[in-house]
Interface confidence: low
Amino acid sequence: CRTSECCFQDPPYSDADSGSASGPRDLSCYRISSAGYECSWQYEGPTAGVSHFLRCCLSSGRCCYFATGSATRLQFSDQAGVSVLHTVTLWVESWARNRTEKSPEVTLQLYKSVKYKPPLGDIKVSKLAGQLRMEWETPDNQVGAEVQFRHRTPSSSWKLGDCGPQDDDTESCLCPLEMNVAQEFQLRRRRLGSQGSSWSKWSSPVCVPPENPPQPQVRFSVEQLGRDGRRRLTLKEQPTQLELPEGCQGPAPGVEVTYQLQLHMLSCPCKAKATRTLPLEKMPYLSGAAYNVAVISSNRFGPGPNQTWHIPADTHTEPVALNISVGTNGTTMYWPARAQSTTYCIEWQPVGQEGSLATCNLTAPQDPDPAGMATYSWSRESGAMGQEKCYHITIFASAHPKKLTLWSTVLSTYHFGGNASAAGTPHHVSVKNHSLDSVSVDWAPSLLSTCPGVLKEYVVRCRDEDSNQVSEHPVQPTETQVTLSDLRAGVAYTVQVRADTAWLRGAWSQPQRFSIKVQVSD
């Protein structure tokens, strides 16, 4: 027999056994030109010493073979003795190590068997009623196709599915969408209405994320507030990466999960913008304010679940960086100014009412005054901080008040509002004999002591009523007792106590009159 013809003789080996796991498979035959044809197949197993024979049986029952040696591809013409206009059955027999292995058969009409291309170029992926819809342009001159898909997850093997017949310039397929795992899809096509004809190769992988983006399991830490009044938010634990099927493990577009950080500044609600969204990679600097932080995961199908944290306000307070002067017209605050044209947000809230909304005021952009101070004033009629109670005051600054991440804390401190002098006056002053020449004086703590850092000291004044001599004794703000020594028996004394702040001298308590009795010896 000539090599270019199909040999109508018995092949030079014994009968084939198709029961082996190895051997030839995936035979496909198709027309490649007006009179030229090609068959190709895969061979599974060791290839050394393997000879392949392409077998063909005509509708008449006559059979022939092509010997291809070690090649797994054969081209022949319509003159090779194989009928191209009628149905033929083809298969491959591979002879090796004194045994023959046979491929599955294909039955087709060679002339009508055109090699179809898989979907090429951009395959559009969308979600439709809980399913996955893939759409692509039909390859040139190949309208009319049957389409199959196969899909797998990171933990499963390929599963085959059918897209049904296609007969248009664009083709589409509805496929199952997994809720929580990524999938890899491939598509293939063959000519519509020619059951025995060969399938195209599989398309490039189409990588599809789960319907639900994963819960963003991350952890944050917040650094301490720096001297510039800002603290860095850092990511302690990156989001876990989505497990991907084998064909999607390179830079696979389509399965990416993007994480965004949504920042909501809770303090200073009167500022222009309270919320900002930024990429998770771009960790921001924050002021010392309280924030809610959400990490939002999203994929090509939209946003997924988010995880929310509360970042408490930095409670570190400055030692008296704020000066408050109360005059007849009203009250003015002074503090060390930031750069030119800075907007300040002054926020205050009664201590113990942290759940309620703070009072908030935004200044116009202001420059430092000649003393390098910034100011904020209000009238007595406004009633601001007018009650006798402790207020927590925080001042924030920004040169760009509309940019949420550019706010910084200027200071955080406490202030006792209203008539602090009267409200802070110590009460319940008592005097007890301590020894022959000393007494113990104690009093109820001043209301000012409820306000952290506000009470600077107590002062105890003792006046000798005989000589009008006065002595003053400073007492730590945490103490409410002092011993007065070197007193003379029989002399009348008055004692008073006052509570002072850094900027305000308190009012004296009611005078307590006492004397040490003279000891009479027997």
Partner: antibody
Framework: QVQLVESGGGVVQPGRSLRLSCAAS????????MHWVRQAPGKGLEWVAI????????YYADSVKGRFTISRDNSKNTLYLQMNSLRAEDTAVYYC????????????WGQGTMVTVSS | QSVLTQPPSVSAAPGQTVTISCSGS????????VSWYQQLPGTAPKLLIY???KRPSGIPDRFSGSKSGTSATLGITGLQTGDEADYYC???????????FGGGTKLTVL
């Protein structure tokens, strides 16, 4: 609305095991730490265990350490308590409770499920 | 024996004020926020006070909480018959790495 529903209670012999479940709805379950708290008949509340939102950290009361395991399945919005080597003193109503996002208080409680350990 | 100590019972007439104490140590109440829970007969506990003195929405301002050192106090003013319940304090214990509760206080409205 925000709800926690416990199930899995019943009568069990000493030394045997039981698994309690707590189904959460109406809130983002995976953002909250979750507790199990129990109450023996006529007695006060006794904390049993806590699990952090991601399931990566757990703490137990000394009385159940080594016998009970707290776990969660965030995809099913469910909290579990696996109770092994049960004793008569484990007889109680078992409540699951949600830890608030913004403070450490248990702000939502289930209605409880009764576990009776008796031979 | 509970880690936090509460009086077993308190009673008062309607309209009166009552306080329930809860004492612990520096590792629990001293270091951490205290919560208070109300358990009406036959029902699950309900959060009454958190962070020592804050009320969740829906809790009337008749209920108040305070903390001083290693002790906390629950105050109820204008007592109503519907306030009859068991009240528990709870907090985190930094040494035990555990949540600890008081033994509970039964409030009777006479």
């Amino acid at each position: 609305q925000v709800q926690l529903v416990e199930s899995g209670g019943g009568v069990v012999q000493p030394g045997r095991s039981l698994r309690l479940s707590c189904a959460a709805s109406g809130f983002t379950f995976s953002s909250h730490g979750m507790h199990w708290v129990r109450q023996a008949p006529g007695k006060g509340l006794e904390w049993v265990a806590i699990i952090w939102y991601a399931g990566n950290k757990k703490y137990y009361a000394d009385s159940v350490k080594g016998r009970f395991t707290i776990s969660r399945d965030n995809s099913k919005n469910t909290l579990y308590l696996q109770m092994n080597s049960l004793r008569a003193e484990d007889t109680a109503v078992y409540y699951c409770a949600r830890e608030s996002l913004l403070n450490s208080a248990s702000d939502i409680w289930g209605q409880g499920t009764m576990v009776t350990v008796s031979s | 024996q509970s880690v936090l100590t509460q009086p077993p019972s308190v009673s008062a007439a309607p309209g009166q004020t009552v306080t329930i104490s809860c004492s612990g140590s520096s590792s629990n109440i001293g270091n951490n926020y205290v919560s208070w829970y109300q358990q009406l007969p036959g029902t699950a506990p309900k959060l009454l006070i958190y962070d020592n003195n804050k009320r969740p929405s829906g809790i009337p301002d008749r209920f108040s909480g305070s903390k001083s050192g290693t002790s906390a106090t629950l105050g109820i003013t204008g007592l109503q018959t519907g306030d009859e319940a068991d009240y528990y304090c709870g907090t985190w214990d930094s040494s035990l790495s555990a949540v600890v509760f008081g033994g509970g206080t039964k409030l009777t409205v006479l």
